[in-house]
């Protein structure tokens, strides 16, 4: 669910996850267009995993699971079903894939209309 | 009907090895996580391991790391414990279990004695 | 590890009385994302626990609505209502916050 991204962000991240509430073309709410760096790129390959997750019948936005925070790493579990494995999976790989960028302030509150309209494929 | 059966369980003697099975029915198996969990002789419950929806990730208690290994066989829907190194304090009845779901299976006995 | 402690062994009950049964954890249950991960279970004599209680207060389908749980992040309550002779058993409360998940010792529920 939205809390548990926003709290595996915070733990492995140095930055706030509102930093990436609209950044870029992908994090955020939708998402189309090129990635324009590698923050860009952590949050597509994000909505690609929910996008796997929503087809194997989970809800990526509402679903809650239990994850614990232990010295700046995301450790999925105790997990109840798969959905809660692969969404926990999700928000760790971008929580880590996050932690490892540098911040671009030109790409905060970008404009959308400059976002192509095709994306890259995913994985 | 979720269904959950154990078996496998007998007298071992110290240092001996077991493999427990389960074969589980009535839900869709790969959609979930699994475990065992033991209840002791003096009737306290203790979770021995679980094992991850597709296999790929295990985990235990510090008292069996190293001894016990949980698997699985998604296509034959049953569940292992692969046991050795067996000591008197694993004498329990062992439970295959989704515990925070339920139900739990009836359970099979391991007796570790020489 | 997480302790999970049940003060009392046993609890005596008078048919058709309430009764309310304690644990306690050493960490906080409450997740960031507001669950509580403590769930309540029962041992009838000769047969294999059953979930009664999930999240702290959530009723398991087909419990009977006279089971009732409540409680803060570390101090939990299972409430019975109007205890009938099927009730008695062994109620054990557990964790799952984190690994490993952890149960207390039980509390033996018995008729007066």
């Known amino acids: 669910g939205i809390l548990e991204l926003a709290g595996t962000v915070g733990c492995v991240g140095p930055r706030t996850p509102i930093a990436y509430m609209k950044y870029g073309c992908f994090c955020g709410l939708g998402g189309h267009g090129q990635p324009r760096d590698a923050i860009d790129w952590c949050c597509h390959g994000h909505d690609c995993c929910y996008t796997r997750a929503e087809e194997a019948g989970c809800s990526p936005k509402t679903e809650r699971y239990s994850w614990q925070c232990v010295n700046q790493s995301v450790l999925c579990g105790p997990a109840e079903n798969k959905c809660q494995e692969l969404l926990c999976k999700c928000d760790q790989e971008i929580a880590n894939c996050l932690a490892q960028t540098e911040y671009n302030l030109k790409y905060l509150f970008y404009p959308q209309f400059l976002c192509e309209p095709d994306s890259p494929k995913c994985d | 009907e979720v269904k959950l059966v154990e078996s496998g369980g007998g007298l071992v003697k110290p240092g001996g090895s077991l493999k427990l099975s389960c074969a589980a029915s009535?839900?869709?198996?790969?959609?979930?996580?699994m475990s065992w969990v033991r209840q002791t002789p003096a009737k306290r419950l203790e979770w021995v391991a679980t094992?991850?929806?597709?296999?790929?990730?295990?985990y235990y208690p510090d008292s069996v790391k190293g001894r016990f290994t949980i698997s699985r066989d998604n296509a034959r829907n049953t569940l292992y414990l692969q046991m050795s190194c067996l000591r008197s304090e694993d004498t329990a009845l062992y439970y295959c279990?989704?515990?925070?779901?339920?139900?739990w299976g009836q359970g099979t006995t391991l007796t570790v004695s020489s | 590890d997480i302790v999970m402690t049940q003060a009392a062994p046993s609890v005596p009950v008078t048919p058709g009385d309430s009764v309310s049964i304690s644990c306690r954890s050493s960490?906080?249950?409450?997740?960031?994302?507001?669950?509580?991960?403590l769930y309540w279970f029962l041992q009838r004599p000769g047969q294999s626990p059953q979930r009664l209680i999930y999240?702290?207060?959530n009723l398991a389908s087909g419990v009977p609505d006279r089971f009732s749980g409540r409680g803060s992040g570390t101090d939990f309550t299972l409430r019975i209502s109007r205890v009938e002779a099927e009730d008695v058993g062994v109620y054990y409360c557990?964790?799952?916050?984190?690994?490993?998940?952890?149960f207390g010792a039980g509390t033996k529920l018995e008729l007066k």
């Open positions: 279990a989704r515990p925070q779901l339920g139900p």
């Open positions: 009535g839900f869709t198996f790969s959609n979930y996580p």
């Open positions: 094992i991850s929806s597709g296999g790929d990730d295990t």
């Open positions: 960490k906080s249950l409450l997740h960031s994302n507001g669950i509580t991960y």
């Open positions: 999240y702290m207060s």
């Open positions: 557990m964790q799952s916050l984190e690994y490993p998940l952890t």
